[in-house]
Structures are given as C-alpha cells and as structure tokens.
Interface confidence: medium
C-alpha cells in the first residue's frame, strides 16, 4: 500500500530535487498543528503568529486580543495561562529545563481588568510549578519543593507544606523516577473540580541511592549533578497523598488519604489521581511488582474531616500474563452519576477495550470488542463517549476517532474520522471543549498534517484551523521517498513494517537497507504519520531503503504480542528484527552485503544486540544512548517488564541480557556507539560499560560522546550527530560523499 506516492513525473524531473541533510537539520519541512486552548464550551484561546493571545468565539464568529504581544514581550513571556474567571493571566518567562517534563520559570500576574501587572506579594522565583484553580483565580504553586496557595493573585501566600527539601522531599512535584516513568508530568497536585480541595503527592527520596555525573561547563572544575535515581532493585521513593481544604487551609491542615491495605502490605507506587466531584476522589495504586493495580474511590467525611476509602469502592486490576495495563495503567473516565466509570483494560481475549464499571470489575460491561484495541477515551458526555482505536481496515498503526451513543439503547457506534480525508488522514487525535460542544481534530498523516474544527453534536467540519499550505508548496519540487506499510506473517506472529523507498525505486535493482528500531515494550514505530526526517533524506538522496518493524513486545495488537517479552527483554525484540531482515532479503531488492541497523535509547539496546547476534546479517550499526544492562536502568520502568534482579526472581535474565555479555560478537561488524555525558535518563555508565567490555575483548569500534548533553542530544549536537551518523553509514555502504 503506497501511502505517500512520489510526485515525480518524467516531464518534471529536472525541476525536482532530492532532500538534503541540511533540509532536515534546518527543519525546512516541519509541520504545524493547532490545538485550541479551550476556555468554555464555545471559546478558545490561541497564540497568533505575531504572539498576541486571541480569544475566539465559535458561535459568534468573533475574536479579540485579550493580551497583546507588547505585554508578552515586556516580561519576555514564552507561555501564558488565563484564570477561569478571566480576570488574570499568568505570564511565564525565564524557562529553564530540568528533566523531560519539568522546568522552572519566573511568573508574572497580569490583571486584565486594569491592564497592569499585579504589584505586591509578587511570586518568588524560580517557581517549579504554578496553576490556577479550576474556578475563580486561586493560585497553587511549588517553590523550593513546598506548596503555596494564594486566594487571589495579590494576596500573601499561605504555605501548605514545610518539609520540602532539594533531592529529599518533593511536595506537589514528582521526583525523577515518578516524573519519567509513572506520572509523565511536571506536577503532582490536582485541584478538585470547583477548587474546594487541593490534592498533592509527597515523595520522600531520603533513602534512594544517588546517580552522580560530571557536568563540565566552562569552569575550572566540573560540577557534579546528583539525582536520587532508583535503579532496578534499589530503594524506591515513599509516596503519600494529602488533600487540603483551600477555603480554610489553616483550620484543619492537609489530610492524608489512606492506602488500600492490599497495596500497603509491601512496596508500592501511586499511579494517578482523578477528581470525581469536589468531595469524591479516585486514586490509583500499584504494587512494586506491577501486575496488581488498585483503583480506590474515596469520599470526604465532613464531620470527621477525613477521606474515607471503603473497601467496597476498591477495584482490583490484575494481569496474569504480563504487567498491569499497557505502558501505564489506564485512568478512569467517570460518568455523570459520579460513581460508575469507563476504563480501558484487557478483555478475555487479551485485547485492550473499553469497559463500563458500575459496582465491581467482575461485573464490568464491555463496551468495545474485537481483534484491535481501544487506545484512548477522550470524553464522556451524558449521551456520547468519544474514543480512539486502530480498528479501521485492520491497520494497527492508524488512529481514528469514534463516537458511541451511550444515551440510547442499544448504543450505536460511528467512526467520526474514517472517511473524512481518507488518503491524507489516517492517524488522528482530538481535543474537546466543555461538554464536547465542539472539538478539534488533528490529523498527523500519512499526508501533510491538517487540523480542523468540528461541531460536537453533528460532527460537521466548521473550519480548517491549520492546513500547512506553506509546507505543501515547499514540498512540490522535492523528490520524497515512497512509503508503504505492510505485514509479514511468520510463525503465527504478525510483523507490521514500514518501508521507505527511494523516489525512483526499481524492484529489479539492489539497495542498501537500514533498519531503524526502537522496539521497547508497548511502543509502536509503524504508524501512518507524516514525517520528513533523517531517514527520509537517506532514502531520497542516498538511495537507501529504510525499514521499521514492530515485533513482539510492541503495542496495540493484543496482549499475546505485547506480553511476549515479559521477564525476557532483549530476546524476541531482536529475533523479530532479524526475521524481518531475512524476509526483506527474500523480496529481491536488498543488497545483503549492505545492511545496517540503528536505534536510540531502547532502540540502541536492540540494535547493539542485533549487531552482536552472530547472524552475519549486519555489516554495521549505530547505538545512540543505549541501555546496556537492565541493572543500570530505572526501577519503575525496568521492573515492570523484568521483575527484580534478585536470585529468587529474575537475576539470571538480567545478567544474560546485557550488551557486555556479547562483546566478542562485535568483532565482525562496524559499531558506532554514541552517548551524551549528562544523560540523566540512560546514564553514560551504560555506554562506558559497553566500551570497557569491547576494549577488554580487544574489539575495534567507533565512538562519539557529546559533552554535557542529555538523552535528547539537542541543539548543535543534533547537527553534529546526524552528520556523523550519515558519514558512518555512507562509508559502511560505500556511498560516495
């Protein structure tokens, strides 16, 4: 199936040009999306091209600037947030990145009623997190690991917590491992729907071992970065959840929410908090051995000023074949009765589907079913449930948006997006206004991305929000590669792959093959999305065939494929890449003497193991920031899939699955190993140990480090990295420069 046909016609060939590496590094062919910042059922904010903050009313068709670019520029603001009562805007500046989601910033409060910045009781700096209450204009913020509350922006702050301490106690923000591997947010506090209560997490990292690495900077002596970072099997953070009444915060103080007894009996995690009403909250907990999750619904007992979580409102989710959930345990979406909810989990056939839970999980009513998966529940209204899935035409790498009418019986299902722009758009996400009165659809491909606005009742398209016309015009004279998504059936396993082919691809010729791999548990690489990136350039200009393969352990094709890698990381992911390569060779257009593999992070681990598989298939390969031993990676992630590195659990496979154990096998391949020295995520230690093992085995290899760069290798390092990797591959494939 050719998804993005080349626009080459013989008459035009002389005006068409191939992609260049410069195009990719300059971001010449990047696309834009439009996500409305919804502020009501029919209004949204958007930052215009000239940096004004504009309010749009869909029903009146009117728009007006609520905040001028001049005001934004006066404090060098890069972000903003309107208070729900529309009286104030916070302006964010001095953005300073910390980890994947976290950053600190300076915040200024602008009073829209008088057109002035709020003076007096200004916010301290830098702030770790700040947010408005959902109603009115209360402010909660985190400063130096403690939480503060302001009833109004100009009021003095009320300090909620006092025990916050750098790298020790975190209030309202996650520590490193919770941020990266559990919450996937920079915050750990949650307002109740009307702003009566504020819930927050406290993380105690006192006993966690610390990862320390040098940050070279420009000084005479390097700095040492210290991060409490629990590696597999190490001591974990201790978490507690508190709720405070923000109307009278001083009267009673924060109340702790009890942990379910079956969870508290051994090491555990808090996984998410969902407010149901102002006096009902839902907490999700997870055993350290992550196959048991408990959802606990708690009610405020006014008279005792406590949160009560009766056992009858505890719902257990357990996996007998793998870990609980997909990448994370799914979160509930509550219905209007404020007790029943919709949730995605595995059905009896091992496919993730939407279930409706009214009393017990055992009595759950299955809402969707089939040999495909429901992926996200966007919104539940009184009469509709909107969700995404990969059901349509049985392509796991697609995403369409569906509506189920839950207000009528029997419920009927409608695909909202399947036939909108069928060739251009097969991978959607959505953003809904209050009560799903309107919604935006964002299509990511396979054609050029487009964002549109729709009526939530009729699904009619109202207008195009962003169609990337400039990008479309810029690509008119570019020889883009062809892309196809197909599947291989091997030993009862379906291996979906994406192949990127040179513009003048000829099946009778032989081409060098590059495998790009990620392959981590619950990931998906074969997706029907648009991209003009490094591999597009390699196909367009350098004439390579690039393939991406989703093997065992990858997502959205059922639990059999997903959980196949449980407790055995580094085995089947590698096998399936190798199997696919053999099938590609059989297709007849691959030069089997010129096959390479590359990957980043988990992909670096898989590419290293594939190179060291002893098959003789690969001439060369690249590992960027690879994991080299699961004992070096974070507890929350690693133990989810591997269990514990103890003798009575899974230590043997931890030891067997290292890259170092296969050092000898690198002798007959060209290996390029790359890592940032300030990688807080996959520590440089991983590559240092690979290099040491290769040296000890007297195996030649190439390496590049990026000083003071983290797991993303951003900025100028990106250019250097892709230039370096390009030279390496061209040399490996004997392509002239």
């Amino acid at each position: 199936i050719v998804l993005r046909p080349s626009r080459v016609h013989n008459s035009e060939e002389n005006t068409m040009r191939a992609l260049t590496l410069k195009d990719i590094l300059n971001g010449t062919f990047s696309y834009k999306t439009f996500f409305p910042n919804w502020i009501s059922g029919q209004e949204y904010l958007h930052q215009s091209a000239d940096n004004n903050i504009v309010l749009y009313n869909i029903e009146t068709g009117q728009s007006y600037t609520i905040l001028s670019n001049r005001t934004m520029k006066s404090v060098n603001a890069s972000n903003y947030g309107l208070s729900p009562d529309r009286q104030f805007v916070y302006l964010e500046s001095d953005y300073s990145k910390l980890w994947r989601y976290s950053y600190t910033a300076t915040y200024y409060i602008y009073d829209l009623s008088n057109g002035e910045f709020v003076r007096g009781n200004e916010l301290p700096r830098p702030i770790q997190y700040l947010c408005w209450s959902p109603v009115g204009s209360k402010l909660a913020y985190v400063y130096q690991n403690n939480i503060y509350l302001k009833q109004r922006p100009g009021d003095p702050p009320f300090q909620i917590t006092f025990n916050g301490r750098e790298n020790k106690i975190f209030n309202g923000i996650p520590d490193w491992v919770y941020e990266e591997e559990m919450l996937a947010t920079k915050y750990a506090l949650w307002w109740s729907p009307n702003g009566k209560f504020l819930a927050y997490a406290e993380f105690n990292d006192t006993d966690i071992p610390v990862i320390a690495y040098s940050y070279y900077g420009d000084e005479q002596y390097p700095r040492t970065i210290n991060i409490p970072y629990p590696k597999a099997g190490a001591k974990n953070p201790v978490v507690r959840i508190f709720i405070i009444d923000t109307t009278y915060p001083a009267y009673v103080g924060p109340q702790e929410v009890p942990v379910p007894a079956m969870i508290a009996s051994s090491d555990y995690y808090f996984s998410w908090l969902t407010w149901v009403t102002d006096e009902r909250v839902c907490l999700q907990w997870l055993k350290r051995v992550q196959n048991v999750s408990v959802l606990s619904i708690c009610d405020f007992r006014e008279d005792w000023q406590t949160w009560d979580c009766p056992k009858t409102q505890e719902h257990i989710e357990e996996s007998r074949t793998g870990w609980a959930g997909g990448f994370f345990v799914s979160t509930p979406v509550f219905s209007y009765d404020a007790i029943s909810y919709y949730k995605i989990f595995s059905d009896k056939d091992g496919y993730k589907h939407i279930h409706y839970i009214k009393d017990t999980v055992e009595n759950a009513i299955q809402i969707t079913s089939g040999k495909w998966e429901a992926i996200n529940i966007f919104r539940v209204t009184q009469d509709s449930l909107f969700y995404s899935s990969n059901e349509f035409e049985e392509y796991p790498g697609r995403r369409n948006i569906y509506r189920i009418s839950i207000g009528s019986y029997p419920p009927s299902k409608k695909c909202v997006t399947c036939h909108l722009r069928k060739e251009r758009c097969q991978y959607y996400t959505a953003s809904f206004s209050d009560y799903a009165k309107y919604y935006a659809l964002v299509c990511y491909g396979p054609g050029i991305p487009i964002s549109t606005l729709h009526d939530g009742r009729t699904d009619q398209e109202i207008k195009i929000l962003e169609e990337n016309k400039e990008l479309e015009n810029a690509l008119k004279n570019i020889q883009l590669p062809k892309e196809e998504i197909k599947k291989l059936e091997v030993d009862e396993i379906t291996l979906w792959y994406k192949m990127i082919l040179p513009p003048q691809f000829d099946r009778s010729k032989k081409y060098p093959l590059l495998i790009q791999v990620y392959g981590g548990p619950c990931s998906q690489s074969v997706r029907s999305v648009f991209a003009v990136n490094w591999i597009s350039y390699l196909a367009s200009k350098e004439g390579m065939v690039i393939a991406l393969v989703d093997g065992r352990g990858t997502a959205f094709q059922g639990d059999k494929l997903l959980y196949a890698v449980y407790r055995k990381l580094g085995v089947y992911e590698v096998e399936d890449q190798i199997t696919a390569v053999r099938k590609f060779i059989e297709m007849g257009f691959i030069d089997e003497k010129r096959i390479a593999i590359w990957g980043w992070s988990y992909g670096g681990y898989v590419s290293s193991l594939a190179l060291a598989s002893g098959t003789g298939l690969f001439k060369c390969g690249i590992a960027v920031a690879p994991v080299s031993s699961w004992e070096y990676y974070a507890s929350v992630y690693t133990e989810r899939f591997m269990g514990l590195p103890t003798k009575d659990d899974n230590l043997e496979h931890y030891k067997n699955s290292t890259v170092m154990a296969r050092a000898e096998y690198f002798r007959n391949v060209d290996y390029l190993l790359i890592h940032g020295t300030a990688d807080d995520n996959v520590h440089f230690q991983n590559s240092a140990q690979i290099a040491k093992a290769l040296v000890n085995a007297q195996v030649d290899f190439q390496a590049m480090w990026y000083s003071d760069q983290n797991h993303g290798l951003s900025g100028l390092s990106t250019n250097h990295l892709y230039t370096h990797m390009t030279h390496f591959l061209k040399q490996c494939f004997s392509l002239s420069d």
Partner: nanobody, 121 residues
Framework: EVQLVESGGGLVQPGGSLRLSCAAS????????MGWFRQAPGKGRELVAA????????YYPDSVEGRFTISRDNAKRMVYLQMNSLRAEDTAVYYC??????????????WGQGTQVTVSS
C-alpha cells in the same frame, strides 16, 4: 490555631468515676474532630475516645467501650470525657487533642499539656 487546656484529673478508687474537661480557644475549634488520648508510663500513646466536628458520631476502642463517653459543646468550645468503672490499667496522663484522627495518631494536630489520672485503692 487551637489552644487546649485539660482539667479534672486526679486520684480515684477502682470502680469510681471522673469527668475530664478540655477548654479550647481559637476560632478553628468547630472545624476539628476531637480526641482523648492517654499515655501510661513506659507505654505508647493510645486513643481512648474521639468525636466528630458536630458531635454526631463518636469512636471508642474496645478497651473503654461502654465505660467512657465523649461529648462536646461547640458553643462553649468544650470537650468532655466521662469515665466510669475505672480500673487500675486506666492510670495514665490523659491528653485532649484536636484534628482529624490520622493526624492525631501521628502526633500532629493540636494537643493539650495533659492531666494525670491515677486509679488506685
């Protein structure tokens, strides 16, 4: 802030009765559940009675159930503990405390200085 002052302790014979009082000052009194705790020499602090904000519900451990009664008067900002059929093992320092029970169990919340109760013949 809540300040608490206990009174009514003393020496009593086994089988006898005592009524402890706790006077509270501070505007947040009525927002807080209240409890009486006790601590015998060489032992940990234990809860003997608790009462909700409005006085609508009470809690007693098995050891004092049926013998002790907790009550409160929000208008007067007072909490009382009526102790009947006293036994030698009830001998302890009795503390009045204000706050949700989980806080009090962790020695958070607001606490009085305590009043001594001795049951002896």
């Amino acid at each position: 802030e809540v300040q608490l002052v206990e009174s009514g302790g003393g020496l009593v014979q086994p089988g006898g009765s005592l009524r402890l009082s706790c006077a509270a000052s501070g505007r947040t009194f009525s927002y807080n559940p209240m409890g009486w705790f006790r601590q015998a020499p060489g032992k940990g602090r234990e809860l003997v009675a608790a009462i909700s904000r409005t006085g609508g519900s009470t809690y007693y451990p098995d050891s004092v159930e049926g013998r002790f009664t907790i009550s409160r008067d929000n208008a007067k900002r007072m909490v009382y503990l009526q102790m009947n059929s006293l036994r030698a093992e009830d001998t302890a320092v009795y503390y009045c405390a204000a706050g949700p029970l989980w806080q009090l169990y962790r020695s958070h919340g607001y606490w009085g200085q305590g009043t001594q109760v001795t049951v002896s013949s």
